[in-house]
């Protein structure tokens, strides 16, 4: 809790690490040869910049931010990544017909910087 001390984006609205949704077809995802349904997925992903202390996941992310300011060529800024996921079930093709399979790390639920 101590690390996640910044939810105000200094770069302006919508520019910092956030959840973003893109509608994608099975063809877009390259899944058409093994997934039958759903034909379209509302893919939620994490995008945006991670400026100083914004949604820092932990102390390591805070340290990374500080060192990036000092040595930008050596230490990269924290990255915007999923903090948790929403599970999703797919109907897949199998040798014998179709089956269900659930994936617990397919869709981002919320985001942080790490």
């Amino acid at each position: 809790a101590r690390a996640r001390n910044g939810d105000h984006c200094p770069l302006g609205p919508g520019r910092c690490c956030r959840l973003h949704t893109v509608r994608a077809s099975l063809e877009d995802l390259g899944w058409a040869d093994w997934v039958l349904r759903p034909r379209e997925v509302q893919v939620t992903m994490c995008i945006g910049a991670c400026p100083s202390q914004f949604r820092a996941a932990n102390m390591h992310a805070q340290i990374k931010t500080s060192l990036h300011r000092l040595k930008p060529d050596t230490v990269p800024a924290p990255c915007c990544v999923p903090a948790s996921y929403n599970p999703m079930v797919l109907i897949q093709k199998t040798d014998t017909g179709v089956s269900l399979q659930t994936y617990d790390d397919l869709l981002a639920k919320d985001c942080h910087c790490i």
């Epitope: 039958l36 034909r39 079930v89």
Partner: antibody, heavy 119, light 110 residues
């Protein structure tokens, strides 16, 4: 308003066939999967199978594979559960339920159809 | 025998907090999600909690879900007479797809 309306209660004899229905309204019927769940008298919930109405793909629980048939008619937004030869042990309440957005939970349920099989 | 294990019954007085457990294994709850349903007497089940800890709109915040390891729990605070019902957990299992717990009957005392 999302609604799943099931057909009425049925009383049948062993060996008879039966087809019960579940009509969806208030949403795009082909955009959500429909599942069937059995509840025997005084017992818990058992997942029977699922159908994707847009392509009529069906997957059954191993416990119900070959015992029942799940189908759908997207032109009238209706899913079906049928038996070719009922047994006394099929006596139960049967619920249809719509799957939520990610296919992991049931967000809307029908009111249930009570099927009684007795000689 | 259900893949997910719940206590057959729990009880509490109005205003109290009760919890209902749901125990699974590494092939279901351990790696995946848990949903909870409420079934009032003589009615169809209703979604109460999805993906471990999310409440659908219209469900009071007195109901909350959590998951730890291969177990999950449903907590109900400020117990009310109308909470008397059967509660079911549900998850996914690689061998049988969607699985339910055996159900827990909640009795509100007094």
């Amino acid at each position: 308003e999302v609604q799943l309306v099931q057909s009425g209660a049925e009383v049948k004899k062993p060996g008879e066939s039966l087809k019960i229905s579940c009509k969806g309204s208030g949403y795009s019927f082909t955009s959500y999967w429909i599942g069937w769940v059995r509840q025997m008298p005084g017992k818990g919930l058992e997942w029977m199978g699922v159908i994707d109405p847009s392509g009529s793909y069906t997957i059954y629980s191993p416990s119900f594979q070959g015992q029942v048939t799940i189908s759908a008619d997207k032109s009238i937004s209706t899913a079906y559960l049928q038996w070719s030869s009922l047994k006394a042990s099929d006596t139960a309440m049967y619920y249809c339920a719509r799957y939520g957005r990610y296919g992991t939970y049931f967000d809307y349920w029908g009111q249930g159809t009570l099927v009684t099989v007795s000689s | 025998q259900s893949v997910l294990t719940q206590p057959p019954s729990v009880s509490g007085a109005p205003g109290q907090r009760v919890t209902i457990s749901c125990s699974g294994s590494s092939s279901n709850i351990g790696v995946l999600y848990v949903n909870w349903y409420q079934q009032l007497p003589g009615t169809a089940p209703k979604l109460l909690i999805y993906s471990n800890d999310n409440r659908p709109s219209g469900v009071p915040d007195r109901f909350s879900g959590s998951k730890s390891g291969t177990s999950a729990s449903l907590a109900i605070t400020g117990l009310q007479a109308e909470d008397e019902a059967d509660y079911y957990c549900q998850s996914w299992d690689s061998s049988s797809n969607y699985v339910f717990g055996g159900g827990t009957k909640l009795t509100v005392l007094g």
